[in-house]
């Protein structure tokens, strides 16, 4: 199909950064300022993305590639290609409709984005809490109580080595 298309389409060989100009008998013309074409054979150039307001320019637009945006300090990217900027919160907080709110007891957030998540329930794994959780940090689970009972050893001694060709004593 691609070969058939290229033989039929007089525009198929216009390089990236140009467009096939119907107003000039289908010759290749450069993309105008503030536009780009990232692939060859284009009949139009796309308008460059503009990084305004809470967005800032991470990569300038060129004739062959779109501009790339990120977010100003205090905000972080959301969505494909940083389509949105969301306000940062402090660690130990989450963003709600009313702004940044502290994590409820029993939950934590160790990042400036995202939601508060419940502390790990150590007992589900038969373990005990070694370090208590905070708004900013999850609990640290320690060994299970059985592991700490007297006489219990966490290391199993290796079986005695047998020399080849000798029967056991």
């Amino acid at each position: 199909f691609e070969r058939t298309r290229s033989l039929q389409d007089p525009c198929s060989n216009c390089p990236a950064g140009t467009f096939c100009d119907n107003n000039r008998n289908q010759i290749c013309s450069p993309c105008p300022p503030n536009s780009f074409s990232s692939a060859g054979g284009q009949r139009t150039c796309d308008i460059c993305r503009q990084c305004k307001g809470v967005f800032r320019t991470r990569k300038e637009c060129s004739s062959t590639s779109n501009a790339e945006c990120d977010c100003t300090p205090g905000f972080h990217c959301l969505g494909a290609g940083c389509s949105m900027c969301e306000q940062d919160c402090k660690q130990g907080q989450e963003l709600t409709k009313k702004g940044c709110k502290d994590c409820c007891f029993g939950t934590f957030n160790d990042q400036k984005r995202g939601i508060c998540r419940p502390w790990t329930n150590c007992s589900l794994d038969g373990k005990s809490v070694l370090v208590n959780g905070t708004k900013e940090r999850d609990v640290v689970c320690g060994p299970s109580p059985a592991d700490l009972s007297p006489g219990a050893s966490s290391v199993t001694p290796p079986a005695p080595a047998r020399e080849p060709g000798h029967s056991p004593q």
Epitope: N13, C14, P15
Partner: nanobody, 121 residues
Framework: EVQLLESGGGEVQPGGSLRLSCAAS????????MGWYRQAPGKRREFVAA???????VYAESVKGRFTISRDNAKNTVYLQMSSLRAEDTAVYYC???????????????WGQGTLVTVKP
């Protein structure tokens, strides 16, 4: 406005050489394919050679090994170096700006006025 101006034609003996030039203006030369065509008296215009922006070239079978097409993007000029000329090469040679930077099955968007090449003993 697109302009294509051929030069370099003239009279030459069989086996001789000529270099045709085509000075282009009014468009982005470096991103477009250019071609040479010719029309002998009483015959249809025919394809001779073409060169795309990336310098890939295509030739008519009748001129392969004798003619060389080249381009100088800094000077917006395309050339046709013709050697081992024959009587049957006698024609008006036209420069063409090709549609869509295509040298395969080329189609001409704009023509020059032509320059006459005469090969005779």
């Amino acid at each position: 406005e697109v302009q294509l101006l051929e030069s370099g034609g003239g009279e030459v003996q069989p086996g001789g050489s000529l270099r045709l030039s085509c000075a282009a203006s009014g468009f982005s030369f470096s991103i477009n394919a250019m071609g040479w065509y010719r029309q002998a008296p009483g015959k249809r215009r025919e394809f001779v050679a073409a060169i795309e922006s990336g310098s890939n070239t295509v030739y008519a079978e009748s001129v392969k090994g004798r003619f060389t097409i080249s381009r100088d993007n800094a000077k917006n000029t395309v050339y046709l170096q013709m050697s081992s000329l024959r009587a049957e090469d006698t024609a008006v040679y036209y420069c063409g700006l090709l549609k869509g930077n295509r040298v395969v099955s080329p189609s001409v968007a704009y023509w020059g006025q032509g320059t006459l090449v005469t090969v005779k003993p």
